[in-house]
C-alpha cells in the first residue's frame, strides 16, 4: 500500500479551483497549501466541494491558525462558517460589520445556531455595546434577536439604537426584557408628537409603569386589545375604569372577550362593580357596592 501522506507528483495545487473537487480527501490535505487556501478563501464557495472535503480544508486552516483565524480569512469563510464550532469562533476577533453580515448571510433562513450566537456575542463584546448599525443588522437577519438577550445584556443597548427596532423584533420578549427596553424607548422617542410617539412606543409598552399608562390615557391613543393584554398586570391594576376607557377608546368593547384573562381579570377584581357597569359591557366580578377596599400594601408600609 502506498503511504498516503505525501502529495503525488503533479498534484500540488497552484490555486484554489474546480480541479480540486476530484481530489481525494487525503490529496487535498497533502497537496493544498494552507497559506494558499487562506489567501483564496473567497474561491471556496464557488466550488462544489463535498461536506467531507470542506472538513479537510477547515482542518488545514485550523493547523495554520491554531490561535484563531484572522479577520481577512473569516470574512471570506462563506459556507465553511457552517463547519465552525462555538469553540472555534471564541478564538476569533471580529470587528468589522461587513464580516458579521457576510457570515450571517451564510446562515440566512435558518434558526440562530450556537455558532451564530457565539459570533454575535464575540462581535458585540468587542464593540462594547449594541450600536444602531449592529442592531439594525442583527434584527434584519434575526427578528427575535433582542429577545434572546438577558436584561443585563439589554442594558448595554444605547437609546439611539432603539430606532432600529421593529414591532416584530419584540414578539418573543418577556416582561423583564421589556422593563429594560421601555425606558430606553421612552427616551429615544421623547421628542415626537402624541400620535407618532404612540405608534413608536406601542410595542415597548409591556414595560411601562402605571403613571405612563395614565398619561397615555389622556392622549386619545385608542390602544388595541392585543397591546393592552401585554401590559404588566401590576401597572394595569391601579388604573380606574375611566382611565382604561380613555386608554382603549373604541377598543374598550374588547374587554368583554378578555374578562377571564390576565391582566383584565385581575383588573376587574379591583374595580367597583358600579364603575364597571358604566361601560355597559356586562363585566362581572367587581367589588360589590357598600364594600370598603383596604389597600393592605399601604397599611404594611405605614406599620
Amino acid at each position: 500500500e502506498v503511504e498516503k501522506t505525501a502529495c503525488p507528483s503533479g498534484k500540488k495545487a497552484r490555486e484554489i479551483d474546480e480541479s480540486l473537487i476530484f481530489y481525494k480527501k487525503w490529496e487535498l490535505e497533502a497537496c493544498v497549501d494552507a497559506a494558499l487556501l487562506a489567501t483564496q478563501m473567497d474561491r471556496v464557495n464557488a466550488i462544489p466541494f463535498t461536506y467531507e472535503q470542506l472538513d479537510v480544508l477547515k482542518h488545514k486552516l485550523d493547523e495554520l491558525y491554531p490561535q484563531g483565524y484572522p479577520e481577512s480569512v473569516i470574512q471570506h469563510l462563506g459556507y465553511l462558517f457552517l463547519k465552525m464550532s462555538p469553540e472555534d469562533i471564541r478564538k476569533w476577533n471580529v470587528t468589522s460589520l461587513e464580516t458579521l453580515k457576510a457570515l450571517l448571510e451564510v446562515n440566512k433562513g435558518h434558526e440562530m445556531s450556537p455558532q451564530v450566537a457565539t459570533l454575535i456575542d464575540r462581535f458585540v463584546k468587542g464593540r462594547g455595546q449594541l450600536d444602531k448599525d449592529t442592531l439594525d443588522t442583527l434584527t434584519a437577519f434575526y427578528p427575535g434577536y433582542l429577545c434572546s438577550l438577558s436584561p443585563e445584556e439589554l442594558s448595554s443597548v444605547p437609546p439611539s439604537s432603539i430606532w432600529a427596532v421593529r414591532p416584530q423584533d419584540l414578539d418573543t420578549c418577556d416582561p423583564r426584557q421589556l422593563d429594560v427596553l421601555y425606558p430606553k424607548a421612552r427616551l429615544a422617542f421623547q421628542n415626537m408628537n402624541g400620535s407618532e410617539y404612540f405608534v413608536k412606543i406601542q410595542s415597548f409598552l409591556g414595560g411601562a409603569p402605571t403613571e405612563d399608562l395614565k398619561a397615555l390615557s389622556q392622549q386619545n391613543v385608542s390602544m388595541d386589545l392585543a397591546t393592552f393584554m401585554k401590559l404588566r398586570t401590576d401597572a394595569v391594576l391601579p388604573l380606574t375604569v375611566a382611565e382604561v376607557q380613555k386608554l382603549l377608546g373604541p377598543h374598550v368593547e374588547g374587554l368583554k372577550a378578555e374578562e377571564r384573562h390576565r391582566p383584565v381579570r385581575d383588573w376587574i377584581l379591583r374595580q367597583r362593580q358600579d364603575d364597571l357597569d358604566t361601560l355597559g359591557l356586562g363585566l362581572q366580578g367587581g367589588i360589590p357596592n357598600g364594600y370598603l377596599v383596604l389597600d393592605l400594601s399601604m397599611q404594611e408600609a405605614l406599620s
Partner: antibody
Framework: QSQLVESGGGLVQPGGSLRLSCAVS????????MGWVRQAPGKCLEYIGY???????YYASWAKGRFTISKDNSKNTVYLQMNSLRAEDTAVYFC????????????????WGQGTLVTVSS | ALQMTQSPSSLSARVGDRVTIKCQAS??????LAWYQQKPGKPPKFLIY???DLASGVPSRFSGSGSGRDFTLTISSLQPEDFATYYC????????????FGCGTKVTVL
C-alpha cells in the same frame, strides 16, 4: 497484521439503546478512518457512517440523530452508540477500517471485523 | 441524493464463464468506486478501488473499469470460489447519503 473485533451486540427491546465497540490492533486510529456497516438477514450492505482520523464524523441520512460514532485513540477502540432502536435495526453490525492511510474514506473499507449481531425484539 | 444502482441483482453462470456486473451512480463520482465480494456468514472482502485498481492479494481475473457514472466489474474466467455476492461502493461522498453501497449482485452456479 490489522485486526478488528466487534462486541456489545445482543438482544435489546424496541426503544432501547446499545453501544457497540470495535477494538483494533496493528494500526493507529489517529492515521485511519473507521466505519460502521450493517447487514440485515438476507439483505444488502447498509452504510451507517464513519469517523475520520481527525475525529470528524459522517453518517447516512437515515442514521443521523439516532446513531453516533466516536473513538478513543488511546484505547484503540471505536464505538457505535445506537438509540431508539426499532425491529428494523436488527442486523449484523460490522466495523471496518478505511483502506487508505490518508485517514479519510477515500478508497473503501479494508479490513473488516467479523460482525456482531444485534436483535431488536420485545 | 447520490445513489448506487447495481445490475443484475442476480445471475447464474458456469465455471470458466466471463461474468460482468454493472454499477451506476446517480451523479458523476469520477473514479471513486470500490468493489467487494461477500460470502454467506462472512464480512465483505475488498477487491478493487479507484474503479480499476486491484487490492492486494486479489487474483488478476478480477478487473474493474468505468468513470463518471457507469462502472463494471468483470471476472474473466469464473472459478468455484467466486460464487458469492458482489457489491459496489461509492467513496466520493459519504455524508448524508441513503447508502454508499449498491444492493449487490448474487452470482450462483448455473
Amino acid at each position: 497484521q490489522s485486526q478488528l473485533v466487534e462486541s456489545g451486540g445482543g438482544l435489546v427491546q424496541p426503544g432501547g439503546s446499545l453501544r457497540l465497540s470495535c477494538a483494533v490492533s496493528g494500526f493507529s486510529l489517529s492515521s485511519y478512518a473507521m466505519g460502521w456497516v450493517r447487514q440485515a438477514p438476507g439483505k444488502c450492505l447498509e452504510y451507517i457512517g464513519y469517523i475520520s482520523k481527525i475525529g470528524t464524523t459522517y453518517y447516512a441520512s437515515w442514521a443521523k440523530g439516532r446513531f453516533t460514532i466516536s473513538k478513543d485513540n488511546s484505547k484503540n477502540t471505536v464505538y457505535l452508540q445506537m438509540n431508539s432502536l426499532r425491529a428494523e435495526d436488527t442486523a449484523v453490525y460490522f466495523c471496518a477500517r478505511g483502506s487508505s492511510s490518508g485517514g479519510y474514506l477515500d478508497d473503501g473499507f479494508d479490513p473488516w471485523g467479523q460482525g456482531t449481531l444485534v436483535t431488536v425484539s420485545s | 441524493a447520490l445513489q448506487m444502482t447495481q445490475s443484475p441483482s442476480s445471475l447464474s453462470a458456469r465455471v470458466g464463464d466471463r461474468v460482468t456486473i454493472k454499477c451506476q451512480a446517480s451523479q458523476s463520482i469520477s473514479n471513486y468506486l470500490a468493489w467487494y465480494q461477500q460470502k454467506p456468514g462472512k464480512p465483505p472482502k475488498f477487491l478493487i478501488y479507484d474503479a480499476s485498481d486491484l487490492a492486494s492479494g486479489v487474483p488478476s481475473r478480477f478487473s474493474g473499469s468505468g468513470s463518471g457514472r457507469d462502472f463494471t466489474l468483470t471476472i474473466s474466467s469464473l472459478q468455484p470460489e467466486d460464487f458469492a455476492t458482489y457489491y459496489c461502493q461509492q467513496v466520493y461522498d459519504s455524508n448524508n447519503v441513503e447508502n454508499v453501497f449498491g444492493c449487490g449482485t448474487k452470482v450462483t452456479v448455473l
